[in-house]
Amino acid sequence: QHHGVTKCNITCSKMTSKIPVALLIHYQQNQASCGKRAIILETRQHRLFCADPKEQWVKDAMQHLDRQAAALTRNGGTFEKQIGEVKPRTTPAAGGMDESVVLEPEATGESSSLEPTPSSQEAQRALGTSPELPTGVTGSSGTRLPPTPKAQDGGPVGTELFRVPPVSTAATWQSSAPHQPGPSLWAEAKTSEAPSTQDPSTQASTASSPAPEENAPSEGQRVWGQGQSPRPENSLEREEMGPVPAHTDAFQDWGPGSMAHVSVVPVSSEGTPSREPVASGSWTPKAEEPIHATMDPQRLGVLITPVPDAQAATRRQ
């Protein structure tokens, strides 16, 4: 595989707070050229977060993902651990990027042409039949909002790198984690996750390309480890909300302040990011702006157009 330039594609200025490893499907290390070392974590909703490799929970999570990947391989699933540049991987799933990430159009990097195949069903949900990324969250106020950026994954909002947009050229990532069901953003990862159940179709919904955003944590939204249990309240359903920004600081923990730079490869199509639920916390809709990046497959220029998210709904009524 040809891994384009080795310049730093993702720089992390803010590290995420703890995320349950159960919500993670992959990790990768950023390049040495980035200076500040960081681990890029991908959640089952295909959201990316910067994590501090020195933190114990991050070490434990990587170890856990390594074990899962090894088990997966033993069980016949193929898992490609790729060590290469950290570029947005291509895949039909919508991903989200956190404020800690800034997209940098990269003219040189040629990424591998691997088309990630939807691996087990889990990843699929990110692109599943539903237009929005799975899951809304509940907030301390008791309302579940529509899925906003990080929640479902459980990643702190504020530190999410970005949602991986569909890219015509796949980027290589070093990942060490078994794929959870769903189209995987990691190139060519296949697994047999759940034997005794039907295989959901994997339709990818278009996703917008990652775009950095700096949103302050919404009020009342829970931070990881904090917040109230989501409870429904009269209010919107957590369904049908407009695309939610891929970078929200739902968790106060993951407040703005982290900016990661990600070089982008041409995206084959433009799409809106599906939203993911915010972590359970007060589910107050945030004013987030999904960013749509249109990339001409022939060019590496990126057009980022903020699209205000007009709708937001809470899950439980």
Epitope: Q124, G128, P134, P200, R238
Partner: antibody, heavy 119, light 107 residues
Framework: QVQLVQSGAEVKKPGASVKVSCKAS????????IHWVKQAPGQGLEWIGW????????KFNERFKGRTTLTADKSTNTAYMLLSSLRSDDTAVYFC????????????WGQGTTVTVSS | DIQMTQSPSSLSASVGDRVTITCRAS??????LAWYQQKPGKAPKLLIY???TLADGVPSRFSGSGSGTQYTLTISSLQPEDFATYFC?????????FGGGTKVEIK
């Protein structure tokens, strides 16, 4: 109001199958994972697995793989758990539950369905 | 898999007593712990998540603490409606696992 309403009690013979349903209301069904939990008589709780209704993706506790099938019908906002080749130790109350997206703890539960396996 | 060991398995207390229930994990669960209350014939009810965050509508007499592998649920002043069985659950990694339960009975 978020609600999970499960089907009624079932009595089955060993070797048979049983399908328990869990109808969700009050929220967008396809946005939240539905989990299934087993509680044998006088025992603790055991996580069986989850299904993501948005695309039907399941994940299982290894202990329940093979004889358990999790499905979801988006048109009726209903999740199902099929237990096949029933044995006496499958006798238990089965709960469906759902939670927020920042972690898989369960803030809403169905009322439980008692499955009795007896010859 | 992470095993959750809860103690004591049962205890007798009186209204007004301070009650403490412990849950020990076989591995570090990084504070991703929830506590539930269950009454006979009913579904469990979420009390606390993320080790110490109170779920909506849960009285402040309930509190959670701990880190690493050791966690505690405390009921500062037991009320008549608190007599029930309590379970802990780790949601750090799958398979999610629960403690064996602690039955709080009236002395």
């Amino acid at each position: 109001q978020v609600q999970l309403v499960q089907s009624g009690a079932e009595v089955k013979k060993p070797g048979a199958s049983v399908k328990v349903s869990c109808k969700a209301s009050g929220y967008t069904f396809t946005n939240y994972y539905i989990h299934w939990v087993k509680q044998a008589p006088g025992q603790g709780l055991e996580w069986i697995g989850w299904i993501y209704p948005g695309d039907g993706s399941p994940k299982f506790n290894e202990r329940f793989k093979g004889r358990t099938t999790l499905t979801a019908d988006k048109s009726t906002n209903t999740a199902y758990m099929l237990l096949s080749s029933l044995r006496s130790d499958d006798t238990a109350v089965y709960f469906c539950a759902t939670g927020p997206t920042d972690g898989d703890y369960f803030d809403y539960w169905g009322q439980g369905t008692t499955v009795t396996v007896s010859s | 898999d992470i095993q959750m060991t809860q103690s004591p398995s049962s205890l007798s207390a009186s209204v007004g007593d301070r009650v403490t229930i412990t849950c020990r994990a076989s591995g570090n669960i990084h504070n991703f712990l929830a506590w539930y209350q269950q009454k006979p014939g009913k579904a469990p009810k979420l009390l606390i998540y993320n080790e110490k965050t109170l779920a909506d509508g849960v009285p402040s007499r309930f509190s959670g603490s701990g880190s690493g592998t050791q966690y505690t649920l405390t009921i500062s002043s037991l009320q008549p409606e608190d007599f029930a069985t309590y379970f802990c659950q780790q949601f750090w990694s799958t398979p999610y696992t629960f403690g064996g339960g602690t039955k709080v009975e009236i002395k």
